[in-house]
Interface confidence: low
């Protein structure tokens, strides 16, 4: 029986050109997490495999950074990044858990005040 629950950062907004952190956490289960997939609609953004580590899809490697934790950092946001993002936890023996985040990227009205940040 699947007893786990996924907590996410929910519905979030960010400015065009900025960066955002997407985070999920799987709780209430003792199942082993074997892999976490991050997907945008039907596109695979990144994979974090328990044994092999992170893999960022080539088409996103310039704008997606792994972490913190099993989360994902999206950089240089465009309005086309608006939409649903999914964290998909592959676990044993439970199976698959999915969390949903909706990101809205807003046109920047004060882009000259923008502050970038980095994930060490």
């Amino acid at each position: 029986m699947m007893t786990g629950t996924i907590e996410t950062t929910g519905n979030i907004s960010a400015e065009k050109g900025g960066s955002i952190i997407l985070q999920c956490h799987l709780s209430s289960t003792t199942a082993q997490v074997t892999q976490v997939n991050w997907e945008q609609q039907d596109q695979l953004l990144a994979i974090c495999n328990a044994d092999l580590g992170w893999h960022i899809s080539p088409s996103f490697k310039d704008r997606v950074a792994p972490g913190p934790g099993l989360g994902l950092t999206l950089q240089s946001l465009t309005v086309n990044d608006t939409g649903e993002y999914f964290c998909i936890y592959h676990t044993y023996p439970d199976g698959t858990y999915t969390g949903r985040i909706f990101l809205e990227v807003l046109e920047s009205s004060v882009a000259e005040h923008g502050a970038r940040f980095q994930i060490p």
């Epitope: 929910g10 907004s13 952190i21 956490h25």
Partner: nanobody, 117 residues
Framework: EVQLVESGGGLVQPGGSLRLSCAAS????????MGWFRQAPGKEREYVAS???????WYADSVKGRFTISADNSKNTTYLQMNSLKPEDTAVYYC???????????WGQGTLVTVSS
Amino acid sequence: EVQLVESGGGLVQPGGSLRLSCAASGNTFSGGFMGWFRQAPGKEREYVASVLRGGYTWYADSVKGRFTISADNSKNTTYLQMNSLKPEDTAVYYCTTDRGYNWNYDWGQGTLVTVSS
């Protein structure tokens, strides 16, 4: 709009401790997370720690085991307990919340932490 007010910074000797607080008011939400970033002179703003409202936490490698982030949801406040401080922790510390928050410029005013003997 979310207003974020940080406090608790100051001058501390290496090995000492400080506790930062960040109070959020205005258009706050019950979901999402709150986090801390810092910016040292001449460097980029960098991630320090964050906490989901349910209590799960993340830390930058440079502060793991020394810093503890927590949140009091009833007060819309997050805290950063900083122990075993090092000179390289000297920076202006900023808090943020990701719900209704525009990452480009909606930061609090920051609180300065100086670690020096």
